[in-house]
Amino acid sequence: AYRPSETLCGGELVDTLQFVCGDRGFYFSRPASRVSRRSRGIVEECCFRSCDLALLETYCATPAKSERDVSTPPTVLPDNFPRYPVGKFFQYDTWKQSTQRLRR
């Protein structure tokens, strides 16, 4: 049976993005001049509405390559573009609980 997707907020949202996006990182910090449109988007979607893994994937900094798309050059971001790196505190077990909720 179809089950509505879950909401993710705060650190749980960050950790889940961290796992989904891996080395690619993801759009995270607020630029000095204005809120990042992507950042605002994922908060509105995932925390205040509902979220699934496919949506999370769209916020990764560099799109995942598919086998059919090996020629596409990687996305190049400016050096100062805010991305969230894989953190030393990230815990797989904690993320696994979150992603299991999203998969159900």
Epitope: C9, G10, L13, S39, V43, C47, F48
Partner: antibody, heavy 122, light 107 residues
Framework: EVQLLESGGGLVQPGGSLRLSCAAS???????IMWWVRQAPGKGLEWVS?????????LYADSVKGRFTISRDNSKNTLYLQMNSLRAEDTAVYYC???????????????WGQGTMVTVSS | DIQMTQSPSSLSASVGDRVTITCRAS??????LNWYQQKPGKAPKLLIY???TLQSGVPSRFSGSGSGTDFTLTISSLQPEDFATYYC?????????FGQGTKVEIK
């Protein structure tokens, strides 16, 4: 100077209503997720509600869900909390606070107002 | 909901003492733990976020550590202005919850 200033508190009878306001200054209000947190006399802190930077998303603690409504007017740099069907247990100092991060509270609340006292009593 | 438990609930210390306050979460919260200081009649003040990051303007005598479920706030050398109540808060998910507070009093 970055500042939040609450107003609208007071004495109200059980079942009554009150609207709190929080005026923001010194920063770009529309860029920030905003919060209401309360503290009953002599007690600890309790999260009440949060609103997204655009105002399009809101969340509430179970204790106030269906009775309180958070909103904001970015053109006026003001956050609101409409409180209906008030109960004695809602008696507290109500603080507005600014989110320190981007993903809803993950870095805590960095700027707080001075608080406004709400007393629910007959 | 994630429950946050602080210990001790109160402590007495002297100026210059090293003070340690602990906070335990009822489930793993990674490093999403914040510490606040509150003085009587005043709003809370953010000291440390994500377990160990010192908020801008906070003196370096404050430090935080821990991950998972166990966290610590340390004041390396207690100053007169540090006598206050300290709260931990988990920012891992909703509902965002606080510890019950630790009151640091003058011995």
């Amino acid at each position: 100077e970055v500042q939040l200033l609450e107003s609208g508190g007071g004495l109200v009878q059980p079942g009554g209503s009150l609207r709190l306001s929080c005026a923001a200054s010194g920063f770009t209000f529309s860029n920030y997720i905003m919060w209401w947190v309360r503290q009953a006399p002599g007690k600890g802190l309790e999260w009440v509600s949060v609103i997204s930077s655009s105002g399009g998303g809101t969340l509430y603690a179970d204790s106030v869900k269906g009775r309180f409504t958070i909103s904001r007017d970015n053109s006026k740099n003001t956050l609101y909390l409409q409180m209906n069907s008030l109960r004695a247990e809602d008696t507290a100092v109500y603080y507005c606070a600014r989110d320190n991060g981007d993903y809803v509270g993950e870095k805590g609340f960095d700027i707080w107002g001075q608080g406004t006292m709400v007393t629910v009593s007959s | 909901d994630i429950q946050m438990t602080q210990s001790p609930s109160s402590l007495s210390a002297s100026v210059g003492d090293r003070v340690t306050i602990t906070c335990r979460a009822s489930q793993s919260i990674s490093n999403y733990l914040n510490w606040y200081q509150q003085k009587p009649g005043k709003a809370p003040k953010l000291l440390i976020y994500t377990a160990s990051t010192l908020q801008s303007g906070v003196p370096s005598r404050f430090s935080g550590s821990g991950s998972g479920t166990d966290f610590t706030l340390t004041i390396s050398s207690l100053q007169p202005e540090d006598f206050a109540t300290y709260y931990c808060q988990q920012s891992y998910n909703s509902p965002w919850t606080f510890g019950q507070g630790t009151k640091v009093e003058i011995k």
